[in-house]
């Protein structure tokens, strides 16, 4: 092909090539042709004769103002036609007359202000019709019943002001899963407008200034329809009462989106008419008081999003939002509750009472004063089968004994990004008999004891990053009870002292993060009592991160037991010479990171075993000594390996001898070196 199109598997991509005409030299068997973002003004039907196999044609983002009816004659198998972002203004009955197999027609962002006659009457197989971002002033798309297989009609961002039954009755035989009317200026729903449609399952009216009154009328018009999903996001619904959604009593609505409404007052029994509702989106509102009966009737809701729904009006404490006790008691089927980013004063004793199916609860950044978790804090969740609890970003400073004793089903507890500073006696976790993960990273300080985790032997993941960990060198180890642990993160704690039994018995450990500590002394031969082999016995360890610890020595047998190690990160240390057989047992190693150390020599006797099955190597920014003895083997290996070595050309540079300083390692000439073959 003389054009710069890329062709792969019968798909031709000719986008962004400044083309002014359709290429005539593409393979004739292509089924998908992408001509977007070019300078095409027309699509001569003759140019498509050779591409009769096309099922998808995308000519979006051009300057096409007219379509030849013969185009589809040449493309009998065409199913998807995308004409978005062009300059079409008129559609005649002939325009798509031969496009009888279309399932998708995209006409968004053109200049179509009116649909005359019946341009879509022949599209009996059409499933999606996108006319959004045009200048349409009505929903009138024809004068006779048509589009019987249409499922998605997208009319957002037009100038539609009224919905009329006589305009929508062309869909009398259609089952619309999605009628998208967002971002219009609708002010009227004429009687029977939705009944004109055969079946309407989804209606989207986001960014339409409905307000409480028009919303109520809308719902009355939706009565006795098949509506399942209703989206009214950003529709200026500032208040709801027990009549707002009355019309929906005669529907089986399962999804309702009321997000971004600045909703202030949720009156009692506002949703009493929605017993079938399952998914309820209320995020980004401004509810000042949730009454005990505000959510009454929502017996089937499984998912409720209240993110940023309760925000304070001013700095005055009196203006904090209120949630009455028992407000959620009606939600017997609720499984997922998101209450992130709110300004709720605290947790009352019956705040969550009645949520007998709740499995996921996010309370991240939810409270203005939740400094201490007591044994009463979560009493209202005692009968909830909660599996995941997120308490991040709440400025929690203390966890008292039995704080979670009500949560016997809990599997994941996230307490990260708080201000917890205390000795962990272990009583904090009492009752967490099924706990799988505790995330405590990014807190003030944690002092461990031998019993810190004595009551949670089921724990598999423990995250203790940047918590100013104290007493980690006690014996027995605080981690001794955690025989099921697979992930342990102790990074960023400036740990300088640990014992060789710190990880003893953790035979299931797979991931160990110890980066950004101060462990260098432990591996020095001059260490009193010799090096400390704190990695011994970790036979199932897969990932080991020891970055930024100041290591300048590695004892020869330190990785001896790590037979399953796949990834090791020793970057940003001060390593110069490594012992000959240090990696001998790492037969499964896939990734090795030694960047930013002081390595001058990469010899086979040290690195040969580690490099054997490597898929990724990072040794950037080391001061390589470009001599035969130091790097000949490495250079030959580099030039023959399939291992991924990022930035090999730019960041693997010789430091010595002086005449090679700054010279790329991979270009070092090994031809004069003896015995440097990388593979035997």
């Amino acid at each position: 092909s003389t054009t710069k199109c890329t062709v792969s598997h019968e798909v031709a991509d000719c986008s962004h090539l400044k083309l002014t005409q359709v290429p005539d030299d593409l393979p004739t068997n292509i089924t998908v042709l992408n001509l977007t973002h070019n300078q095409l003004r027309r699509l001569p039907a003759a140019n498509f004769t050779r591409y009769s196999q096309l099922t998808s044609l995308d000519v979006g983002f051009n300057t096409i103002s007219k379509l030849e009816p013969e185009l589809c004659q040449k493309l009998p198998m065409l199913k998807v036609l995308n004409l978005q972002h062009n300059e079409l203004s008129q559609l005649s009955d002939k325009t798509f007359a031969f496009c009888t197999n279309l399932t998708e027609l995209h006409l968004m962002s053109n200049s179509i202000q009116k649909i005359k006659n019946n341009p879509f009457v022949k599209q009996k197989n059409l499933i999606t019709l996108d006319l959004s971002h045009n200048g349409l002033s009505s929903t009138k798309l024809g004068t006779q019943v048509q589009l019987e297989n249409l499922q998605e009609l997208l009319l957002s961002n037009n100038k539609i002001q009224a919905l009329k039954s006589e305009e929508l009755d062309i869909f009398a035989n259609s089952s619309l899963k999605k009628l998208e009317l967002s971002s219009n200026q609708i002010k009227e729903f004429s009687p029977g407008c939705f009944h004109a449609i055969g079946r309407l399952f989804g209606l989207f009216l986001n960014n339409v200034q409905l307000g409480p009154s028009l919303t109520e009328k809308l719902c009355l018009e939706l009565a006795n329809t098949s509506i399942r999903n209703l989206s009214l996001s950003n529709s200026q619904l500032s208040t709801t009462s027990n009549t707002t959604f009355l019309g929906l009593k005669w529907t089986n609505l399962t999804m309702l989106d009321l997000s971004y409404n600045n909703l202030n007052v949720v009156g009692n029994d506002s949703f009493a008419w929605l017993p079938q509702l399952e998914y309820f989106f209320l995020e980004y509102n401004n509810i000042q008081h949730l009454f005990s009966h505000s959510l009454h009737g929502l017996f089937n809701v499984r998912y409720l999003n209240l993110k940023r729904s309760f925000t304070k009006q001013s700095i005055s404490l009196a203006s904090l939002p209120k949630i009455d006790d028992f407000s959620f008691q009606w939600l017997k089927c609720l499984e997922h509750l998101n209450m992130e980013d709110n300004d709720i004063p605290g947790i009352k004793s019956n705040m969550f009472t009645g949520l007998i199916n709740l499995k996921y609860l996010s309370l991240s950044n939810s409270f203005t004063s939740l400094r201490t978790l007591t044994n009463e804090t979560f009493v209202s969740l005692a009968h909830s089968p909660l599996h995941i609890l997120n308490l991040t970003k709440n400025k929690i400073s203390k966890i008292e004994s039995d704080a979670f004793s009500w949560l016997g089903h809990l599997e994941v507890l996230d307490l990260g990004l708080n201000e917890i500073g205390q000795e962990l006696t272990g009583q904090e976790w009492r009752g967490l008999e099924n706990i799988f993960e505790i995330y405590l990273s990014y807190n003030k300080y944690l002092q461990l004891t031998r019993n810190s985790f004595a009551l949670v032997p089921s724990l598999q993941r423990l995250m203790l990053r940047r918590v100013a960990l104290k007493n980690v060198d006690s014996s027995p180890s605080p981690f001794q009870p955690l025989r099921n642990l697979t992930i342990l993160d102790l990074s960023n704690n400036n740990i300088a002292n640990i014992n060789d039994d710190m990880l003893e018995g953790l035979e299931k450990l797979e991931i160990l993060d110890l980066q950004h500590n101060n462990l260098a002394r432990l591996w020095k031969h001059a260490n009193p009592g010799g090096p400390i082999y704190f990695l011994k016995g970790l036979s199932h360890l897969h990932i080991l991160n020891l970055e930024s610890n100041g290591f300048d020595e590695i004892p020869v047998e330190v990785f001896k037991d790590l037979f399953e190690l796949k990834i090791i990160d020793l970057g940003l240390n001060n390593l110069n010479t490594l012992p000959a057989s240090v990696f001998n047992n790492q037969v499964s190693l896939k990734s090795l990171n030694l960047q930013k150390n002081l390595i001058t020599s990469v010899e086979k006797k040290v690195f040969g075993p580690a490099f054997r099955n490597l898929t990724e190597l990072d040794m950037r920014f080391n001061p390589f000594d470009c001599t035969c003895e130091s790097i000949a083997w490495f250079v030959n290996w580099i030039n023959e390996t399939h291992t991924n070595i990022p930035e090999l050309s730019s960041h693997y540079l010789c430091n010595t001898p002086p005449h090679y300083h700054g010279f790329p390692v991979r270009l070092f000439d090994t031809s004069s070196c003896k015995d440097s073959a990388p593979f035997e």
């Epitope: 004994s401 006696t425 272990g426 009583q427 009492r430 004891t449 031998r450 019993n451 004595a454 009551l455 032997p457 014996s475 027995p476 001794q480 009870p481 025989r483 014992n499 060789d500 039994d501 003893e504 018995g505 035979e507 016995g537």
Partner: antibody, heavy 119, light 107 residues
Framework: QVQLVQSGAEVKKPGASVKVSCKAS????????IHWVRQAPGQGLEWMGE????????NYNEKFKTRVTMTRDTSISTAYMELSRLRSDDTAVYYC????????????WGQGTLVTVSS | DIQMTQSPSSLSASVGDRVTITCRAS??????LAWFQQKPGKAPKSLIY???TLADGVPSRFSGSGSGTDFTLTISSLQPEDFATYYC?????????FGQGTKLEIK
């Protein structure tokens, strides 16, 4: 199943030493600390100390620190407790014990070794 | 060191009786308290740990309660095989001291 089998009864003279053994089976010896507890005739139980069979690290009860030595031989999965400078009030049954999944109780005990100190 | 004080030191009761033994710690041991049963010539047997959790195979007539410094072992309906000596022991910090024992005898 986990078993702790102790050595037989001993009779010792005051001032002598005694070494009691505790052979473990049914689990990996090096992964659980071994504790020693004694009981004088007609008296209560007294915790003496604990040893990590993996590295030999020990936490003693201060009361016994100067006279007790706890050791282990991992090759034969055996822990030892040696008490020196024996006195008559050291006459007791000496037990070894081990924690379980919960490290806050002793589900496993040896059968006990009676040490009699008599001139 | 934390001292453990058990009471009473001995107790006479009949089969079917409800019996309560108490144990007081000289400092806060949270809930790290275990109860053991010992019969003459035998090693102690674990009954309860973490103040209230029943050890494997222990009949439900045994129960434990308490937290901090005051703890209780209750036998709801004494059976003939329950006559023995009972000890509490803390597991908060070394040394793991025992109570002096409570001898439960047939009345």
């Amino acid at each position: 199943q986990v078993q702790l089998v102790q050595s037989g009864a001993e009779v010792k003279k005051p001032g002598a030493s005694v070494k009691v053994s505790c052979k473990a089976s049914g689990y990996t010896f090096t992964t659980y600390w071994i504790h020693w507890v004694r009981q004088a005739p007609g008296q209560g139980l007294e915790w003496m100390g604990e040893i990590n069979p993996n590295n030999g690290r020990i936490n003693y009860n201060e009361k016994f620190k100067t006279r007790v030595t706890m050791t282990r031989d991992t090759s034969i999965s055996t822990a030892y407790m040696e008490l020196s400078r024996l006195r008559s009030d050291d006459t007791a049954v000496y037990y070894c014990a081990r924690v379980g999944v919960m490290i806050t109780t002793f589900p496993y005990w040896g059968q006990g070794t009676l040490v009699t100190v008599s001139s | 060191d934390i001292q453990m004080t058990q009471s009473p030191s001995s107790l006479s009761a009949s089969v079917g009786d409800r019996v309560t033994i108490t144990c007081r710690a000289s400092g806060n041991i949270h809930n790290y308290l275990a109860w053991f049963q010992q019969k003459p010539g035998k090693a102690p047997k674990s009954l309860i740990y973490n103040a209230k959790t029943l050890a494997d195979g222990v009949p439900s007539r045994f129960s434990g309660s308490g937290s901090g410094t005051d703890f209780t072992l209750t036998i709801s309906s004494l059976q003939p095989e329950d006559f023995a000596t009972y000890y509490c022991q803390h597991f908060w910090s070394t040394p793991f001291t025992f109570g002096q024992g409570t001898k439960l005898e047939i009345k």
